[in-house]
Each structure stands twice: as C-alpha cells, then as structure tokens.
C-alpha cells in the first residue's frame, strides 16, 4: 500500500481581517495511525494552533468529524483573523507512539495573509497658530493595515498638495504597517474656513479612501489692521474717535484706549461682525472732553490680540483748534509716525 | 481583458420580480465593489448603490431602498440585481460597473440590461 | 448631495476641430472627476479619472482638467467616431453624481 501523504491544497490563503480563515488539508491513508496536529511555521520555534487530541482551542474548529474511524479531512477553520495570524500553517500527521506519539509527515503548507483595513487617518496640525504667508506641517497617522500597498493623498479645499513627505513602517515584513505623512501648507488671510484633508486608499476600502480632516480655524492667527478716525463733533466740547478693527481670527481680542499714554479704558471684544472669510471685525468708540486739556491730547488705540504683542494706532486731538471746525478725519492722518508697535 | 458581462433583456408585468447578472472576468473579483446604475429613457444616469464583494454588505441610494436588493456569487465572480414589485418606471437600462482601489471610480462597465415593464 | 451641472446639452463641431465640455460640482470635490463617453445603444465608457488621468487606451486628443468645483473635457482634432454623449461623474463622496451629459454633434 501507497505511504500517507499529507495534501495542503493550497499555498496560499488570503483572508480579511475579522473573517474566517479555512486550511484545507487532507490525508490519502487511514495508516498509520494517529492524530492530526497544525503549526504555524516550522522547526523547534513552531508555535501549535491545534491538536487532535488534546487541549483547548477556542477559535479553531474543525471542518469534518475527526472522531469519525475513516475521516480524511483534516481542514481546520480558524475564526476572528488578525494580522497576527498571518504566516505558514503546517498540517502534520503523526503516528501513535509510546510514550509520545512521533511526527510522521507533513503537508507542504499554506501561507495565510491576512488583509486588514487602514485605521482612520488622524490630522494634527502646529501646537501653535501662525500667521498668514508662513508655511505649517500637518501630520497624518493611520496604523494596522496590510499589505503594505497604500496611498496617501493631502489636499487644501479643492486643491491637490504636492509638498509632502511620506513613510511606511516598518520597512521590511510585518504583519501590519502603518503610514505616516507630513505636509507643508502656505497660510492665506482667506484660510479660516479652509480645511486640510489626508486621503488613504487600500486595497481592503472597496467603497470610497479613508479621510481626515482638519480646519485650519485652529491654526491661524489673523492679525487685526486698525485705523483710528475722528467722527463730527457730538457736542461744544467733546470728540468721539473710534478704532476700527477689521479683519482679524480668533476672537479672543483686548483694546486699550491711551490719553496721552495714561490708560482710559480697556474692553474686550464682544459684540464682533463675522466676515464672509471668517474673519472678525470690531468697533471701539472713546468720548473725549476737550474741555479737559490744555495741551494737544495723542489718543492711542493699542490692541491685544490672541495674547500676541500688541499693536497700536495713534491719532492727535488738537485743543487749540475748535472742536467744530473738526472735519471727521482732521488730524487723523495715521502716517507712519503714528503708528506704535509695543512689545 | 477586463470584462462584465450581463443577462439579457427582459420583459416584465407590474408586480413580477426581476434578477439581473453581472459577471466578471479577468480580475480578482473580490478586490473591487460592485455598483448598479440606472438608466431611465430620455433621463439621467443614476447611481443605485453598491455591493461590497469581499463581505457582501450592501448599500443602497435612498431612492432604491426597499424593492430592490444586491447579491452575490462570489465563487462565479458574480453580482446580482434584484427588483421585486416591479413598477412601470422601473423600465430603464440597468448597468453594472467596477469599482474600487486605488482610483475610486467606475472604470469598467457591463454592457447593460434593458428591462421593460408593461401590462 | 453632489449636484453636477453641465450647462450644455448639446454642442457642434466639425471634424479636426477642438471642443471642451464643463462641469461644475456645487461643492468641492477636489480633483475626484471622471468623464465617461457614450454612444448610442452601448454603455459608458471610462475615458478620465481623478479629473485628468486618462483611462487605459484612451487616446491622447481626450484631455481633462479642473479642481474643486469646475472641470473640463477637452477634446482636440475631433473625429466622427467622437460622436457621443459625454458626461461626468463625482467619485469624492456617496451617493455617486452624475452630471446630466452633453450630446457632441459632428457638423
């Protein structure tokens, strides 16, 4: 009679993560007799994923009734794959022996590969905000897919970036990879409502990429343009100037009213207008009693914004001329002369 | 080279039920979903839903939930389109299309299916 | 969901010349465009992906362009056999929107 021969079908086996994964594997004789047992890899670091004779092994079962007398089939399913389970199974048969039973042959093996789903793309952008003109990393992370095959795509709004760089990990074999980008994007005044997205497309996302996104609301920092103006006359002896701030992202804004350097007033922005791109426009009036001065008064408005150093606009009140020959921007000339940065 | 190839004609009364194939050659079946779109006499191409051919899960447009339900057969390369209760404005032509990694459109498409119905 | 408008339903054009169909998304898409070609009584044919890759086989004289919202097909030394519809696809997100085709008429 022909000696057994241990038949494994299949070289390879390619299962999705959480599926099922069945290792066919068949004898061709009933002799000798003894059991069945399936290793992963071979030689003395195997590790065993099922024995037919004994112990517990909760995610395999078996395709046939091994306890039938003329059973052959030999296939074994093993359930909620991971891509740990990824490597070569080895169906071996072995001949009943005393103490121990002794490895007769082996089948020539299935190597199963597991395909897993990239993670969702995770975006981070600078832990601190920047300003327009300046460019900004964002970094995208996904993990635990395989194969190694991916790609990665950044866009801003409806555009394609090109400036980026890209790495999987690890280099060589393993039974998951994971991707990591970082992509360099130029900062506009109009970029509040923009938003930067990573694409991931795998093998395993037959419907549509991964995407993640982030809004570069919470990387910009906007600085405020200020202009300071003198309106008519409200009555004999005071002046009403204001501070219009125009244009600035985020909110958070504090202004100061300076006579002459000597604080007057102080107030944070509430009461704000949004603008089409998000950003942010605010008002500050000061009532001045010219009656009050002697000597010609330099009005400062000096704004906070976003815990930045501030910024500031002067503008000078002449005492000496009447308040109502004032037109609403005598005096306002806001050259450059008048324009202090303090820090 | 790359082909879907779909059944035939049919002719149907309001009420019956249709099953339509789609079968796929040249590929590895399962690397790629399977979408439906339909096209209604004089009207615009509409995307009915998909079917992903690795799990088997299908999506539907809102506009085809209910009456209609997508197959398949996995082992035949095989994917199926079922309307059940078949309405008057169910006559159109039905393709099937390929789609998937790395491009995410709809790269290879069946020949189509023409189903009228009518009493 | 994605509206794809092509404002023309029908252009003429005689042979060798240059035509360029448009197609606007009501929302951003970035550059997830296709166009598909048609010819009476077959079935659409993949002519370019992600707004300016062309299919495979797909001669060089069918050319795309466009990003985010605004997309063109244009096609250079038109030839008989180009009479068909031509319509475009969004592939950013679901459900999947076609827009509603211009018929080419070869004078």
């Known amino acids: 009679e022909e000696e057994l021969q241990v038949i494994q079908p299949d070289k390879s086996v390619l299962v999705a993560a959480g599926e099922t994964a069945t290792l066919r594997c068949t004898a061709t004789s009933l002799i000798p007799v003894g059991p069945i047992q399936w290793f992963r890899g071979a030689g003395p670091g195997r590790e065993l994923i099922y024995n037919q004779k004994e112990g517990h092994f909760p995610r395999v079962t078996t395709v046939s009734d091994l306890t039938k007398r003329n059973n052959m089939d030999f296939s074994i399913r093993i359930g909620n794959i991971t891509p740990a389970d990824a490597g070569t199974y080895y169906c071996v048969k072995f001949r009943k022996g005393s103490p121990d039973d002794v490895e007769f042959k082996s089948g020539a093996g299935t190597e199963l590969s597991v395909r897993a789903k990239p993670s969702a793309p995770v975006v981070s952008g600078p832990a601190a905000r920047a300003t327009p003109q300046h460019t900004v990393s964002f970094t995208c992370e996904s993990h635990g897919f395989s194969p190694r095959d991916i790609t990665l795509k950044w866009f801003k709004n409806g555009n394609e970036l090109s400036d980026f760089q890209t790495n999987v990990d690890p280099v060589g074999e393993s039974v998951s990879y994971s991707i990591h980008s970082t992509a360099k994007v130029v900062l506009t005044r109009e970029d509040v409502h923009s938003q930067v997205i990573c694409e991931v497309a795998h093998v395993t996302l037959q419907g549509d990429p991964l995407r993640g996104t982030a809004n570069l609301s919470e990387t910009i920092r906007v600085p405020p343009t200020l202009e300071v103006t003198q309106q008519p006359v409200r009555a004999e002896n005071q002046v009403n100037v204001t501070c219009q701030v125009r244009k600035f992202y985020p909110q958070r804004l504090q202004l100061t009213w300076l006579e002459n350097g000597n604080v007057s007033r102080t107030e944070t922005a509430s009461t704000v207008t949004e603008n089409k791109d998000g950003t942010y426009n605010w008002m500050s009036w000061l009532l001045v009693n010219v009656s009050a001065h002697r000597d010609d008064v330099k009005l400062t408005c000096q704004v906070e914004h976003d815990g930045q150093p501030a910024v500031s606009k002067s503008h000078d009140l002449k005492v000496s001329a009447h308040p109502k020959e004032q037109g609403s921007n005598t005096a306002a000339e806001n050259t450059g002369s008048n324009e202090r940065n303090i820090y | 080279q790359i082909q879907l190839v779909q059944s035939g004609p049919e002719l149907k009364k309001p009420g019956e039920t249709v099953k339509i194939s789609c079968k796929a050659s040249?590929?590895?079946?399962?690397?790629?979903?399977m979408h439906w779109v339909k096209q209604a006499p004089g009207k615009d191409l509409k995307w009915m839903g998909w079917i992903n051919t690795e799990t088997g899960e299908p999506t539907y447009a809102d506009d085809f939930k209910g009456r209609f339900a997508f197959s398949l057969e996995a082992s035949a390369s095989t994917a199926y389109l079922q309307i059940n209760n078949l309405k008057n404005e169910d006559t159109a032509t039905y393709f099937c299309?390929?789609?998937?990694?790395?491009?995410?459109?709809?790269?290879?498409w069946g020949q189509g299916t023409t189903l009228t119905v009518s009493s | 969901d994605i509206v794809m408008t092509q404002s023309q339903k029908f252009m003429s054009t005689s042979v060798g010349d240059r035509v360029s169909i448009t197609c606007k998304a009501s929302q951003n898409v970035p550059t997830a465009v296709a166009w598909y070609q048609q010819k009476p009584g077959q079935s659409p044919k993949a002519l370019i992906y992600l707004a300016s890759n062309r299919h495979t086989g797909v001669p060089d004289r069918f050319t795309g362009s466009g990003s985010g919202t605004d997309f063109t097909l244009t096609i250079t030394n038109v030839q008989s056999e180009d009479l068909a519809d031509y319509f475009c696809l969004q592939h950013w997100n679901y459900p999947r929107t076609f827009g509603g085709g211009t018929k080419l008429e070869i004078k």
């Open positions: 040249d590929y590895t079946f399962t690397d790629y979903s």
């Open positions: 299309a390929r789609h998937g990694y790395p491009h995410y459109y709809f790269d290879y």
